[in-house]
């Protein structure tokens, strides 16, 4: 029991999750492309989810998508419309901790 406790505590010691940079608010123009960046790091590597106005983001082929990056995740919206205005939040978890950041797309 003692050795297994030591192993798990070592694992806990190596586990971390950090929001490296808060998300910026973005003001842009109709028809343009906007990119929102979720900059997080962690161990185990975090899972990142995107929300708009407190609801899971709906991906739209060739227009709205998100993908993993070396720094976390990037959400890209092409051909911006007024309907895209709102709060965009990324939520990252490594299974133990959760961090989030919110930006506004004006």
């Amino acid at each position: 029991p003692t050795s297994s406790w030591n192993i798990s505590s070592e694992l806990n010691k190596d586990s971390y999750l950090t929001l490296d940079e808060p998300m910026n608010n973005i003001t842009t123009s109709l028809g343009q492309t906007a990119e929102l960046h979720c900059k997080v790091s962690g161990n185990p590597p975090p899972t990142i989810r995107w929300f708009k106005n407190d609801a899971p983001v709906v991906q739209e082929p060739r227009r709205l998508s998100f993908r993993s990056t070396i720094y976390g995740s990037r959400l890209r919206i092409r051909n911006l419309d007024t309907t895209d205005t709102g709060y965009f939040q990324c939520v990252a978890t490594n299974g133990k901790e959760v961090v989030s950041s919110t930006g506004v797309l004006f």
Epitope: N53, D54, V58, T83
Partner: antibody
């Protein structure tokens, strides 16, 4: 206690102007979006305009664009709706409401103020 | 704009009845749907947000659910104070759009 209190409604002739006020209290005004929603007599709810009080960004429904202007004075915790070139179809109860940071669900509403456009 | 088609437009029910009101979005609005109750001469009140989250202070007989683009408000056991008009609202896309309302009347 959270309160939103509208004022400034009344009877106005077609083509006339009115300015509605929405006085907020009981919460930190500049971390909310303030909305104006209207309801014509016996009809449903229609979004009119909103303003991010912390960023100044505004949105207008097509039906009022170019005629109505929404603004906010964070020092007075008050939002305004300037209504110009009023039409009979603008007759409605006008409500101000707020949505918390992160969502557009409207969690508090004022009691409403009636605007009647008639000759 | 996104259309929110609400049904029925009115219904008659008795105290104690289970009441279901539905809204269908014209395209996906994720879970960004709220439900409001409005009584005559009064402002709307928020009941449900994020499709299924009960707003603070709202009785637990109210519940919301989602299946794709279909959203449902359920009142498990209708009380005398529940006779009112109910509206759904999507707020995923700007501008948020409301359903046309459902009036719940006494049978």
């Amino acid at each position: 206690e959270v309160q939103l209190v509208e004022s400034g409604g009344g009877l106005v002739q077609p083509g006339g102007s009115l300015r509605l006020s929405c006085a907020a209290s009981g919460f930190t005004f500049d971390s909310y979006v303030i909305h104006w929603v209207r309801q014509a007599p016996g009809k449903g709810l229609e979004w009119v305009a909103y303003i991010f009080s912390f960023g100044g960004y505004t949105y207008y429904a097509d039906s009022v664009k170019g005629r109505f202007t929404i603004s906010a004075d964070t020092s007075k915790n008050t939002a305004y709706l300037q209504m110009n070139s009023l039409r009979a179809e603008d007759t409605a109860v006008y409500y101000c409401a707020r949505s918390p940071y992160g969502t557009f669900a409207l969690d508090y509403w004022g009691q409403g103020t009636l605007v009647t456009v008639s000759s | 704009d996104i259309q929110m088609t609400q049904s029925p437009s009115s219904l008659s029910a008795s105290v104690g009845d289970r009441v279901t009101i539905t809204c269908r979005a014209s395209q996906s609005v994720s879970s960004a749907v709220a439900w409001y109750q409005q009584k005559p001469g009064k402002a709307p009140k928020l009941l449900i947000y994020s499709a299924s989250s009960l707003y603070s202070g709202v009785p637990s007989r109210f519940s919301g659910s989602r299946s794709g683009t279909d959203f449902t408000l359920t009142i498990s056991s209708l009380q005398p104070e529940d006779f009112a008009t109910y509206y759904c609202q999507q707020y995923y896309y700007t501008p948020g759009t409301f359903g046309q309302g459902t009036k719940v009347e006494i049978k």
